[in-house]
């Protein structure tokens, strides 16, 4: 069998809210992959999970089910939204993130997503990490591919 | 709908203060920053100050330090901007407008006419 | 102070026209973090508030008609209107929205031809 390629795009939206008296913030983060097909045969992506890390936490999780399959020589793009609160321990970051002070409120966001496809009865996982820049005091929104080049370091796959 | 009532026009004599209103409804008004911007007739836009109505907090542009300040009353859901030593150049429409917090400014006032001659 | 320029200042234009208006920022407007431009557009009818059209440099506000394109990076911001309709005659302002205080253009009038 060929290579099934996963490559992360990046952030595709990011849209903030707050909780005033929890102290808490809420961003609600779209990703897009690319997942190519390098085979002559389909492939079935049989689910995405991806979580969302802030200073080491994990703030966000996600999984997709029985998301596509893909046809041979062909690739996919395909979207998926973690949820992440950041509170408790680290509320102190909601001062941060809403300081009237500033306009401009970059955090460093770990990003980790691991797809798992399947071919003739054979699982395969192929995971990415990438740090990428979130601006957490304000909803952000991305034209295809604009933020494909945002990542702070791009760890050893 | 969403609406800020800014109080009506006023015409003042140079010298002392004057204080405009501005009355949110429909949305939590903690949860938004108030702004306050300046548009003399026929001219452009410049922004005041904001001020956070959770917690009182303001951000002035230096320009207009000392002569405008910022103040809310959460209970009446009500945020104030008093000018003073007032002139002729102050003389303008002021608005107030809010953001979710350091969104963009996404929706205004009517505006406040302020007129200041003898 | 970031200083916002627009150019030109008025335009006649005929309905059906497609309209280039420009603003050029004194500091680049990118979040380097992010890679987005903290530029907004607004138009502004007499008699009334100025109304948000366009974030984010290039992100049309919802309701505002696919005619409104905004486009550019760092210092240099243009807003397209494909084919400028009798109800888009009003004033443009471009504003500055990376950093305190906020600044706006001198904005650009259009007018029916």
């Known amino acids: 069998p060929r290579s099934i390629d996963v490559k992360y795009i990046g952030v595709k939206s990011a849209y903030v809210s707050y909780d005033v008296q929890k102290r808490t913030i809420y961003l609600n983060i779209t990703n897009t992959l690319n997942i190519t097909n390098n085979n002559y045969y389909s492939v079935e992506v049989e689910n995405i999970t991806a979580q969302v890390q802030f200073a080491k936490t994990v703030i966000g999780k996600a999984r997709l089910n029985n998301i596509t399959h893909i046809g041979p020589l062909d690739m996919k793009q395909i979207d998926y939204t973690v949820p992440t609160v950041i509170a408790e321990e680290m509320s102190y970051m909601y001062d941060f993130c809403t300081l009237i002070s500033i306009k401009v409120h970059n955090i460093v966001l770990m990003m980790q997503v691991t797809v798992t496809t399947t071919y003739f009865g054979h699982s395969e996982q192929i995971s990415q990490e990438r740090y990428q820049y979130v601006d957490c005091g304000r909803n952000t929104t991305y034209q295809l591919g604009q933020s494909e080049y945002l990542n702070v370091l791009q760890p050893q796959q | 709908e969403v609406q800020l009532q800014q109080s009506g026009p006023v015409l003042v004599k140079p010298g002392p203060s004057v204080k405009i209103s501005c009355m949110a409804s429909?949305?939590?008004?903690?949860?938004?920053?108030i702004h306050w911007v300046k548009q003399s007739h026929g001219k452009s836009l410049e922004w005041i100050g904001l001020?956070?109505?959770?917690?009182?907090?303001?951000n002035y542009n230096q320009n207009f330090k000392g002569k405008a300040t910022l103040t809310v009353d959460t209970s009446s859901r009500t945020a104030y901007m008093e000018l003073n030593s007032l002139t002729s150049e102050d003389s303008a429409v002021y608005y107030c407008?809010?953001?979710?917090?350091?969104?963009?400014?996404?929706?205004w006032g009517q505006g406040t006419l302020v007129t200041v001659s003898e | 102070d970031i200083v916002m320029t627009q150019s030109p200042s008025s335009l006649s234009v005929s309905v059906g026209e497609k309209v280039t208006v420009s603003c050029k920022s004194s500091?680049?407007?990118?979040?380097?973090?992010?890679?987005?431009?903290?530029l907004a557009w607004y138009q502004q009818k007499p008699g009334q508030p100025p109304k948000l059209l366009i974030y984010?440099?290039?992100t049309r506000e919802s309701g505002v008609p696919d005619r409104f394109t905004g486009s550019g990076s760092g210092t240099d911001f243009t807003l397209t209107i494909s084919s400028v309709q009798a109800e888009d005659l009003a004033v443009y302002y471009c504003?500055?929205?990376?950093?305190?205080?906020?600044?706006f253009g001198a904005g650009t009038k259009l007018e029916l031809k």
């Open positions: 001020v956070y109505p959770y917690n009182g907090g303001t």
């Open positions: 500091q680049s407007l990118l979040n380097s973090g992010n890679q987005k431009n903290y």
């Open positions: 984010g440099a290039s």
């Open positions: 407008a809010r953001s979710y917090f350091s969104n963009p400014i996404g929706y």
């Open positions: 504003q500055n929205d990376h950093s305190y205080p906020l600044t």
């Open positions: 429909v949305f939590t008004f903690n949860d938004y920053y």
